[in-house]
């Protein structure tokens, strides 16, 4: 799903006080429900009638350094007998999130937030055939 | 997907400099690649032979202020003729995605990452029957 | 604009060959799927092949495998659906189509050519 524009004055303070000077934020350490975790069933990605491999991509001054990616296996979706049909399609389930950047130079050490689109996973649909012109 | 612990390292400085004070670290303004857009099929959650619907929930003190969670509408899958099968089951895809907290007293805004367990949709799997012992 | 012109279409007896090919013009080739489908007299549209745009993944309807090969020309930015063993029952209109988002939905079409098996 989509996550807005910032048009910047989430992070902005309130009119009647003082700018944030040089275009920096304080952000405090630590991170609210942390330990919260998915709960999702076991080996879906195998299950599944639109079944996806994983990919992991690794960037230590990224955090979460790893993000997962998800492919879709086929173009069509498993049938009852475990055979590919092709006249429905495996299509991937994306969404939008956020990642921290870290940028240093020195001791000097600033962090920005960075918008990652992820695919979660695949659905299998009825395509849409739209008629011939 | 997981989001891993932060172990607080990552936004540690290097250990041969002097620690960040008060707990709190420098988060630039502007968000990298925010027009990037996710490029999902439309009506896919209604398409989908896992159909779902959104909730969504709004909240002015987070960025991003709208966090959209899916819910699946059967618990069966639908078949080729419209009709719900309880042989399949329709199951959420989950992702572990951040979203800032902002926090303020008067003048002084900082602000805190938040781990949020978002449902982008759902799949049709292949239940798994254990057997009875 | 994505434009889509099926040629190669044609009379041919049971049991020959005619390679269908189709330039993709505009984004389309490079990202999203490529199909062919194909729709016989008073009967549904139905999938013959499709891709992925980055020809890492083919797959075929069970009707045509083993005897269908879809491939794409990415110099010439053009899909081709080469087809062998033809028998009567492949006898229909065949149409190349993409589909921009890899969403399953099939927005661009060409405007279809005749393959008519005789036996």
């Known amino acids: 799903r989509k996550i807005p524009k910032v048009g910047h004055t989430f992070f902005q303070k309130p009119e009647s006080c003082p700018p944030v000077p040089g275009g920096s934020m304080k952000l405090d350490i630590g991170i609210i429900n942390e330990n919260q975790r998915v709960s999702m069933s076991r080996n879906i990605e195998s299950r599944s009638t639109s079944p996806w491999n994983y990919t992991v991509t690794w960037d230590p001054n990224r955090y979460p350094s790893e993000v997962v990616q998800a492919q879709c296996r086929n173009l069509g979706c498993i049938n009852a007998q475990g055979k590919e049909d092709i006249s429905m399609n495996s299509v991937p389930i994306q969404q939008e999130t956020l990642v921290v950047r870290r940028k240093h130079q020195g001791c000097s050490v600033s962090f920005q937030l960075e918008k990652v689109l992820v695919t979660v996973g695949c659905t299998c649909v009825t395509p849409v055939i739209h008629h011939v012109q | 997907r997981k989001i891993p612990k932060v172990g607080h390292t990552f936004f540690q400085k290097p250990e041969s400099c002097p620690p960040v004070p008060g707990g709190s670290m420098k988060l630039d303004i502007g968000i990298i690649n925010e027009n990037q857009r996710v490029s999902m099929s439309r009506n896919i959650e209604s398409r989908s032979t896992s159909p779902w619907n959104y909730t969504v929930t709004w909240d002015p003190n987070r960025y991003p202020s709208e966090v959209v969670q899916a819910q699946c509408r059967n618990l069966g899958c639908i078949n080729a003729q419209g009709k719900e099968d309880i042989s399949m089951n329709s199951v959420p895809i989950q992702q572990e995605t951040l979203v800032v907290r902002r926090k303020h007293q008067g003048c002084s805004v900082s602000f805190q990452l938040e781990k949020v367990l978002v449902t982008v949709g759902c799949t049709c799997v292949t239940p798994v029957i254990h057997h009875v012992q | 604009e994505v434009q889509l012109v099926e040629s190669g279409g044609g009379l041919v007896q049971a049991g020959g060959s005619l390679r269908l090919s189709c330039p993709v013009s505009g984004r389309a080739f490079s990202r999203g799927r490529l199909g062919w489908f194909r729709q016989a007299p008073g009967k549904e549209r139905e999938f013959v092949a499709v891709?992925?745009?980055?020809?890492?993944?083919?797959s075929y309807a069970d009707s045509v495998k083993g005897r269908f090969t879809f491939s794409r020309d990415n110099a010439k930015n053009t899909m081709n659906l080469q087809m062998n063993s033809l028998k009567p029952e492949d006898t229909a209109v065949y149409y190349c189509?993409?589909?921009?988002?890899?969403?399953?939905?099939?927005?661009?079409w060409g405007q279809g050519t005749q393959v008519t098996v005789s036996s």
């Open positions: 189509a993409a589909d921009s988002e890899t969403s399953g939905n099939w927005v661009y």
């Open positions: 891709a992925h745009w980055s020809g890492a993944i083919t």
